[in-house]
């Protein structure tokens, strides 16, 4: 079997939904040593970035300005070392937002509710589109989907403390073009009187997962590797 | 704005060489990444050479070893340097621009680039 390299992370650095005419920073982590990286958008190549020095770093950041709907899609990265190439990375999907309209989100019975009770939210959006999305704040990976004319629901069944937090919703054109978002709603939810003031709210910060850590290696870096390598061929 | 303006097409017979001028207006050449991309009669547009805003160049398969793409940030030009031609290389050449840029990007993808030339037609014919 043809040899390859281990294949590299792609994540999109602060979010993967990015505003049209704004800019998109994709990272594609490798490997030291790696002395090309590809950007690949829709299985044709996109981008490539060639560190410098490569032995210094372990990855690469791709700036894709002006985002529009030609740029919103599924992208992947691979690098290379010397004449090896790695397997692909994981897809990712970029979303290109503020497209068109602006929803307007609602929820029944209403934001404040207890726990147990059932809880719907309701997002509409006039101009024709069929798919609509609910993302819960500092949860965007977790879309919900739902679809309708004008207006998609997203029954929550009974809620718990967990649901609380802060809503939005977009409406579709396409997997890859949505609207602006609405306003948010705020989910209010009351638990028991022994744990309502201890149930925790969800994070309102950006998703954790959604950052670059790319390093530069130190000459302590390396010299632990090489110590490491020295020790890995004692213990042999 | 950036506006870009290509030169150098013309008739050439195969294995004749041409060089190619696109000159952008506007303060932000140097921060802009610029490639080159043809499209024959009745074909789809093809990307051909790209070059980042430090100089890291990539070019097609198909004219590698053949076209050089340089750059001239001082005139605020790019240029693409055709030799060995072939019947195959008849089409209208665009540059292209992204701006900006960071870091040291080459741009390979036509959905990629936001500004277009009107382009120039080269024609390699005995």
């Known amino acids: 079997p043809k040899q390859t390299l281990p294949k590299p992370i792609i994540r999109a650095e602060s979010t993967y939904m990015v505003p049209k005419e704004k800019q998109a920073t994709l990272c594609c982590q490798g490997s030291y040593g790696a002395v090309e990286y590809q950007l690949h958008f829709e299985g044709s190549l996109f981008a490539v970035e060639r560190p410098k020095p490569p032995e210094r770093i372990n990855g690469v950041k791709f700036h894709i300005p002006d985002m529009n709907s030609r740029k919103a899609g599924r992208y992947s990265c691979i690098y290379r070392v010397g004449e090896l190439w790695s397997e692909r990375s994981d897809l990712l999907d970029l979303v290109v937002t503020e497209m068109y309209d602006t929803p307007t989100l609602s929820v029944h019975p209403g934001p404040e509710v207890t726990s147990g009770e059932k809880v719907t939210f309701y997002c509409r959006l006039d101009t024709a589109t069929s798919m609509f999305l609910l993302l819960k704040e500092g949860r965007s990976r977790d879309v919900q989907r739902s679809y309708g004319k004008v207006q998609a629901e997203f029954p929550m069944g009974p809620v718990t403390t967990a649901h609380r937090g802060s809503y939005r919703c977009f409406g579709s054109y396409n997997n890859y073009a949505w609207s602006f978002p609405s306003e948010p709603v705020k989910l209010l939810v009351t638990g028991d009187i022994e744990n309502t003031s201890l149930a925790p709210t969800d994070p309102t910060f950006p998703d954790s997962w959604d950052t670059c850590l790319l390093t530069r290696e130190t000459g302590l870096q390396k010299d632990l590797a090489l110590w490491d390598h020295t020790a890995q061929n004692l213990l042999r | 704005e950036v506006q870009l303006v290509e030169s150098g097409g013309g008739e050439v017979q195969p294995g004749g060489s041409l060089r190619l001028s696109c000159a952008a207006s506007?303060?932000?050449?140097?921060?802009?990444?610029m490639g080159w991309f043809r499209q024959a009669p009745g074909k789809e547009r093809e990307f051909v050479a790209a070059?980042?805003?430090?100089?890291?160049?990539y070019y097609a398969e198909s004219v590698k070893g053949r076209f050089t793409i340089s750059r001239d940030n001082a005139k605020n030009t790019v240029y693409l340097q055709m030799s060995s031609l072939r019947a195959e290389d008849t089409a209208v050449y665009y540059c292209?621009?992204?701006?900006?840029?960071?870091?040291?990007?080459?741009?390979?993808?036509?959905?990629?680039?936001?500004?277009w030339g009107q382009g120039t037609l080269v024609t390699v014919k005995p």
């Open positions: 070059i980042s805003r430090s100089d890291d160049t």
């Open positions: 292209a621009a992204v701006v900006p840029t960071y870091g040291n990007t080459i741009y390979v993808h036509s959905a990629a680039y936001n500004y």
């Open positions: 506007g303060r932000t050449f140097a921060s802009a990444a």
